[in-house]
């Protein structure tokens, strides 16, 4: 039960995280005009990964896409790549994890296969989250560097006569969305990996013992519990003698009202 909950929660948390990563990637407010200690402008500038926007005091907003690839800063390209890789890995992870969910039965899929799929999706979520966090952090670092550079040259002029006020940019909402979303995806991935350990059935670390009763011979291979050592193959425990207790996995495998067929 705890394993199913952990897996389900991991899936939901990752789903929210990936939705957040997609939202952050699409958002225009990665960097926003710094309004503190700046001349009061009648426009508000903000920029995303794909376009830059200007909102005028009238409320009129105009956005222009970056219609060039080669002309863009390498850092921006790197951030784009990291976010896209994060989304792709996260999407594949979600697809894999849907089939790995314990509450969903697909044919006669072995628990070991579900465990492997859970682990795979977990790793994908972790990498996806890390990509998002890395992408957002690289962009944030770029902003901080540019902020202090523009602060140093805030007023550049020709002989001190004509002044050009440089627009300084600070952290936009998308950065915080990205950090939180990346963190959630990472946490979801870790939860999936933890769930994988609980899902994987393991054989005991010792051989079957033969008991000789007076009436008839029965070979009993212990399978009513799981070995706690963590070793052994991931094949499903089979009982030669049918009178023993069911394994934990077998108890769960019977259809219930919560199952989705």
């Amino acid at each position: 039960m705890a394993v199913t909950a952990c897996q389900g929660l991991g899936f939901v948390v990752s789903l929210i995280g990936i939705a957040g990563i997609i939202a952050a990637t699409c958002m225009d407010q990665w960097s926003t005009q710094d309004l503190y200690n700046n001349p009061v402008t009648a426009v508000f500038n903000y920029q995303g990964l794909w376009r830059s926007c200007v909102r005028e005091s009238s409320g009129f907003t105009e956005c222009r896409g970056y219609f060039t690839l080669l002309g863009l800063p390498a850092m921006l390209q790197a951030v784009r790549a990291l976010m896209i890789v994060g989304i792709v890995l996260g999407a594949i992870g979600l697809l894999v994890s849907i089939f790995a969910l314990k509450c969903i039965r697909i044919g006669s899929m072995e628990d070991s296969a579900k465990a492997n799929m859970t682990l795979t999706s977990g790793i994908m979520f972790i990498v996806s989250g890390l990509c998002a966090i890395a992408g957002v952090s690289v962009f944030a670092n770029m902003l901080v560097t540019n902020f202090w550079m523009s602060t140093a040259n805030m007023y550049t002029g020709m002989g001190g006569m004509v002044q050009t006020v440089q627009t300084r940019y600070t952290f936009g909402a998308a950065l915080f969305v990205g950090w939180v979303a990346g963190g959630l995806t990472l946490i979801g991935g870790v939860m999936m990996c933890i769930a994988c350990r609980g899902l994987a059935p393991e054989e005991t670390n010792y051989k079957a013992v033969s008991y000789h009763a007076s009436g008839h011979s029965v070979a009993y291979k212990p399978g009513g519990f799981k070995a706690s050592t963590g070793f052994g193959s991931n094949t499903k425990n089979k009982k030669i003698y049918d009178g023993g207790a069911r394994t934990e996995d077998e108890v769960q495998s019977y259809p219930s009202k919560h199952d989705y067929v």
Epitope: Q33, P39, A42, V43, V54, S58, F60, Q163, T167
Partner: antibody, heavy 120, light 113 residues
Amino acid sequence: EVQLVESGGGLVQPGGSLRLSCAASGFTFSDYGIHWVRQAPGKGLEWIAYISRGSSTIYYADTVKGRFTISRDNAKNSLYLQMTSLRAEDTAVYYCARGGYDTRNAMDYWGQGTTVTVSS
Amino acid sequence: DIVMTQSPDSLAVSLGERATISCKSSQSLLNSGNQKNYLAWYQQKPGQPPKLLIYGASTRASGVPDRFSGSGSGTDFTLTISSLQAEDVAIYHCQNDLYYPLTFGQGTKLEIK
């Protein structure tokens, strides 16, 4: 047809108060920011205040800050300028002007103006 | 505050001739976010309120004859009337539309020679 009509001007003594009104018609008033601009006799134009469409953003010129208050009532399609502690240098024709939606913040329509004379 | 300086203060041009008014700002009116200039030109005829002629330094407002044109970028701007008509006699004002307080030039009086 877009129309802005100012009213409330007149003769007032130094230190006195006056409230100017601007009645708007011919457009959706609540969709536009509005400015007050004045022009002293024989002088150039001087921007004095701005209020955004939802009254969330208000700006004043330093010369009137603390003395003048801009406000609006979108339900009545009206703009107001409450002027206190009036000085002789506040004597001017006061215009209300609409901030254009896609005119790079330029004022696309102006009222005919109302005259304020501050004199003892 | 941004200081807007117009030149000349007054200008007399013959009918049908070209009239050029200059406007300089103390700071660049070019917004880096969209590479647009936030400068407007207004025409004010005697006893009338100003009328918007040009916005964004070079875009004609609706209903403005095409003999009026605006140019320039950053700090230097120009209003040109390609062929002066009698009805163009007025005072012309330039205005900073980028920084608050919004500021106007002192105005240029255009007359017929």
